[in-house]
């Protein structure tokens, strides 16, 4: 099966991917609506009615030779100009601006908090299982297994710092060598890029927005995958990361210093620790084969404890375990000895919601997973809406020009490197690449940042997260200092190597092209985004994990043919696009294969059949919620449903299925072009509940 169906058709016919409007306005040349109404000599335009309170920004494509879906929308100010406002209007405008800024910061705060809680939720759901992945002895000999364990554990706990700290603990206690730890670190790097891809899924409502957001998020994934694809074999062959980092560690005489600075956590921790607090040592203990840890809960109950060293009577298996015979005795059944035991006395309970519920970890995890995803989704929607109303006219022009414009010639090439530094700096401030890239995703979606600019920012983010790890390593206790520093440096040099591979020469910026290709496919077939997520972050790693456990012969036996087919497909794809004449007529396109092997259309039909029955009730529910929301705030036009619901209704109208009459708050008409490719379900469900 061709790995990227219809990727060849990504650019030649962009109109295929273009909706009638990127938000709720038609794509027209830069002319006012009034002109369009009278003068029909221009591009034919479908009448659109603007939702006043939804957005005061008109989205317009800048006139180009060909409509490119990747061109950023121009957010044109359709509000009253500052000079035309009276004193009262100006004051109101200022207060509105301040209000929006406060709201934006508030939603951003809860967005970051929900990411933190999401990570905790994943750790509760899959943390113990993730810990057990590490206790597999085959990691030592199989770098591929190490890689997938790194991916899976990081995906399961939603935190590369957790998986990295487990690796550090294992290296420090000689359960793992640095050589075996490097592939795990590479895997952790891949796993951490799932967060912003999940965040991008939240923007699925608007095709053009989703195209940009999803591509912007997956550019991180492709960079990590491609880096591993090249650098893992290089590392296995040469051990360059291990050697270089060892030389650095040995050349310095480090003293363990202060704790690494907690910057963003200072603000978010007071809130997140009221929701849940975890004892992350449990995952590390499971990874280190501590049997007692398997029965421990990850939910922290006691926050204030007193640890005291006392001599305690403990049983030993036999007299041979006694340091000397005079230190052992019997009670008639068992042999006892005296040991220095650290006795932990519980003083004060933690102050979080789940402290007194005594629920199993899985239950707490699922509850938090649902809540955090809802909050994440809600905050993202609100951030996008606020940014949409703030970033318009002059503000948008200034911001977009500042972020996306290159330095003047001959220093244009420096801009990207500055972006890398900015990404690294910002990530260092927020102490998490997930948080930074997730915050970047909606900005890419609404068109404030281009993917070309988001790419170096993301690469910088990868560097930023490793500098945090280096600082944390320098602050670690003496027994783990060397190993944690060497692993942090391996992570750092891996990312540096990746940047050197996939950034300096524009031609090598393959992740951008791949992400755009995936963005196009996912905008057309939105289910493919979820499919991609499951395949790349779960199925492939789990398959490799299973095959690795079966042994090298099985892994090679299955892997070699698969890799051979992939290479064959890629070579054929390259020849088809570059020099098709070299190939026999039959091989000049994929038509010789069954349709389902080179196109997503048949798959889309199958998936639509399954998801169809759920779409209408979902949109009905959305409209009910909107109505309640509008009734509560007393504004009849404040809310609208996701564009996919409108697409669905359009499709049904086309098939003669009655759709409810628009309410006062459904003040919108949608062009046929805006329908896109979403097929209406066969079921002729009426949304009469409203």
């Amino acid at each position: 099966m061709a790995p990227w169906p219809e990727l060849g058709d990504a650019q030649p016919n962009p109109s295929k991917y273009l909706e009638g409007a990127t938000s709720q306005q038609p794509i027209t040349p830069d002319k006012s609506k009034e002109t369009n109404k009278t003068d029909n000599t221009e591009v034919p335009v479908t009448k659109f009615e603007l939702l006043p309170t939804y957005s005061t920004a008109t989205l317009i494509e800048e006139p180009t030779e060909v409509d490119d879906p990747w061109n950023l929308p121009t957010l044109q100010d359709s509000g009253i100009k500052w000079s035309e406002r009276d004193a009262k209007g100006k004051i109101l405008c200022v207060f509105q601006g301040i209000g929006r800024l406060i709201l934006l910061l508030g939603f951003l705060y809860f967005f970051v908090c929900s990411l933190d809680v999401l990570s905790s939720a994943f750790q509760l759901v899959g943390g113990k299982m993730a810990g057990q992945f590490f206790s597999n002895s085959s990691i030592m000999s199989n770098p591929l297994l190490g890689l997938v364990i790194g991916v899976l554990v990081t995906v399961f706990v939603q935190s590369s710092s957790t998986s990295t700290s487990i690796v550090v603990s294992m290296v420090a206690s000689s359960l793992l060598t640095v050589r075996a730890a490097i592939p795990i670190i590479m895997g952790a790097n891949i796993g951490t890029s799932i967060t912003n891809t999940i965040v991008a899924l939240m923007q699925v409502g608007d095709r053009s927005e989703f195209r940009r957001a999803f591509a912007g998020a997956t550019v991180h994934d492709f960079f990590n995958w491609l880096s591993v694809l090249v650098l893992l074999p290089v590392e296995v062959a040469t051990h360059y990361l291990e050697v270089v980092t060892q030389l650095i560690v040995e050349s310095f005489h480090f003293k363990n210093g202060e704790d690494a600075p907690d910057l963003l956590k200072v603000i978010t921790k007071p809130f997140t620790k009221l929701i849940v607090q975890l004892d992350k040592k449990v995952i590390s203990q499971i990874a280190m084969n501590d049997e007692t840890a398997k029965n421990k809960s990850l939910v922290k109950i006691w926050c204030k404890t007193f640890t005291n060293m006392t001599q305690m009577n403990v049983t030993v298996p036999s007299m041979a375990n006694c340091t000397s015979h005079s230190l052992c005795w019997t009670d008639g059944i068992q042999i006892w000895t005296m040991k220095n035991v650290t006795y932990k006395e519980n003083i004060a309970k933690c102050q979080h919601i789940f402290v007194n519920f005594h629920l199993p970890d899985l239950a707490v995890g699922i509850i938090l997973l649902i809540i955090s995803l809802l909050v994440l989704c809600g905050c993202l929607i609100m951030i996008v809406k606020i940014l949409g109303s703030v970033l318009k006219g002059q503000v948008a022009t200034v911001i977009k020009k500042t972020i996306n414009t290159d330095f003047p010639f001959p220093f244009a090439w420096l801009t990207g490197y500055l972006a890398i530094l900015v990404g690294a700096g910002m990530t260092f401030i927020v102490q998490s690449s997930s948080v930074f890239t997730s915050a970047l995703t909606p900005l890419i979606g609404i068109g404030v940042i281009t993917i070309e600019r988001a790419y170096p920012l993301t690469l910088g983010s990868n560097i930023g997260t490793t500098t945090t790890a280096i600082l944390a390593a320098l602050a670690s206790p003496g027994n783990t200092l060397r190993s944690s520093l060497q692993i942090a440096l391996c992570h750092f040099f891996f990312n540096i190597s990746g940047i050197l591979l996939w950034y300096p020469i524009p031609f090598t910026r393959l992740p951008i092209r791949m992400a755009k290709g995936l963005g196009n496919i996912s905008a057309k077939y939105r289910w493919f985004a979820v499919f991609y997520l499951i395949i790349f972050f779960f199925l492939i790693p789990l398959t490799v994990f299973g095959l690795s456990l079966a042994g090298w012969p099985v892994l090679v036996g299955v892997g070699v043919p698969v890799v051979f087919i992939i290479i064959l497909v890629l070579c054929l794809r390259l020849l088809q696009s570059r020099c098709p004449r070299v190939l026999p007529k039959k091989l000049q396109n994929w038509n010789f294969l069954p349709l389902c092997m080179h196109s997503l259309k048949p798959w889309d039909a199958v998936i639509s059949k399954f998801t169809g029955p759920f779409q209408m009730p979902c949109c009905c529910c959305c409209r009910v919620c909107c109505r309640v929301c509008c009734l509560l705030c007393g504004c009849p036009k404040c809310c609208r449903c996701s564009k996919c619901c409108q697409d669905l209704e359009e499709g049904q109208e086309a098939q003669g299925v009655p759709v409810k009459a628009p309410e006062t708050f459904d003040n919108i008409t949608i062009s046929r072009e805006a329908q896109g490719e979403v097929r209406a379900p066969d079921s002729k469900t009426e949304c009469t509940a409203l």
Epitope: H325, L327, W329, T330, D331, G332, I333
Partner: antibody, heavy 119, light 107 residues
Framework: EVQLVQSGAEVVKPGASVKMSCKAS????????IHWVKQAPGQGLEWIGA????????SYKQKFRGRATLTADTSTSTVYMELSSLRSEDSAVYYC????????????WGQGTLVTVSS | DIQMTQSPSSLSASVGDRVTITCSAS??????LNWYQQKPGKTVKVLIY???SLYSGVPSRFSGSGSGTDYTLTISSLQPEDFATYYC?????????FGQGTKLELK
């Protein structure tokens, strides 16, 4: 109050078996080890073995291994000692005693069961 | 097995006397030694545990000392109720073993 009450005196024939009991009360039965001690007439004390009712774990002096069997019934808080293949030298007073936690110090003793092996 | 040897086997003393009974182990028992008192027709009573620790409820005239292989039980001022047989017992290793006993009689 901790009490160990033993069964009454037994007269048995050589080669036969005897099963004596020791009923515990006044403490958590499964939390302490019960030891059995033999005292032949005019002789000193001799340890036979011990049982931990909490797990059923036992240990015996080599001399009595195979002939002495210790069991515990947690429902009645009673420990039993069965002595088989009795010989005349087995005529003695058999005591049960409770050991202290993590220490073979016998703080509480039963009143003893006199076993007489006679043909 | 660890052999425990008590001396003397019997001892005559008067009320108010200071009496010392010794117990010798065949190997180092690291203070894991108890002292018991047995009166005819009465249950056995523990006096001293861990070589020198006085068991609760036991009069302070009883004391224990020693280390390694040699241990002693001392009654500082003999009382009429103290006339009985005394046993030492080690719990350093299995099997647990007792001394043959020291009979304390009234002179």
């Amino acid at each position: 109050e901790v009490q160990l009450v033993q069964s009454g005196a037994e007269v048995v024939k050589p080669g036969a078996s005897v099963k004596m009991s020791c009923k515990a009360s006044g403490y958590t039965f499964t939390g302490y080890i019960i030891h059995w001690v033999k005292q032949a007439p005019g002789q000193g004390l001799e340890w036979i073995g011990a049982i931990y009712p909490g797990s059923g774990a036992t240990s015996y002096k080599q001399k009595f291994r195979g002939r002495a069997t210790l069991t515990a019934d947690t429902s009645t808080s009673t420990v039993y000692m069965e002595l088989s293949s009795l010989r005349s030298e087995d005529s003695a007073v058999y005591y049960c005693a409770r050991g202290e936690t993590a220490r073979a110090t016998f703080a509480y003793w039963g009143q003893g069961t006199l076993v007489t092996v006679s043909s | 097995d660890i052999q425990m040897t008590q001396s003397p086997s019997s001892l005559s003393a008067s009320v108010g006397d200071r009496v010392t009974i010794t117990c010798s182990a065949s190997q180092d028992i690291g203070n894991f030694l108890n002292w018991y008192q047995q009166k005819p027709g009465k249950t056995v009573k523990v006096l001293i545990y861990y070589a020198s620790s006085l068991y609760s409820g036991v009069p302070s005239r009883f004391s224990g000392s020693g280390s390694g292989t040699d241990y002693t039980l001392t009654i500082s001022s003999l009382q009429p109720e103290d006339f009985a047989t005394y046993y030492c017992q080690q719990y350093s290793k299995l099997p647990l073993t007792f001394g043959q006993g020291t009979k304390l009689e009234l002179k």
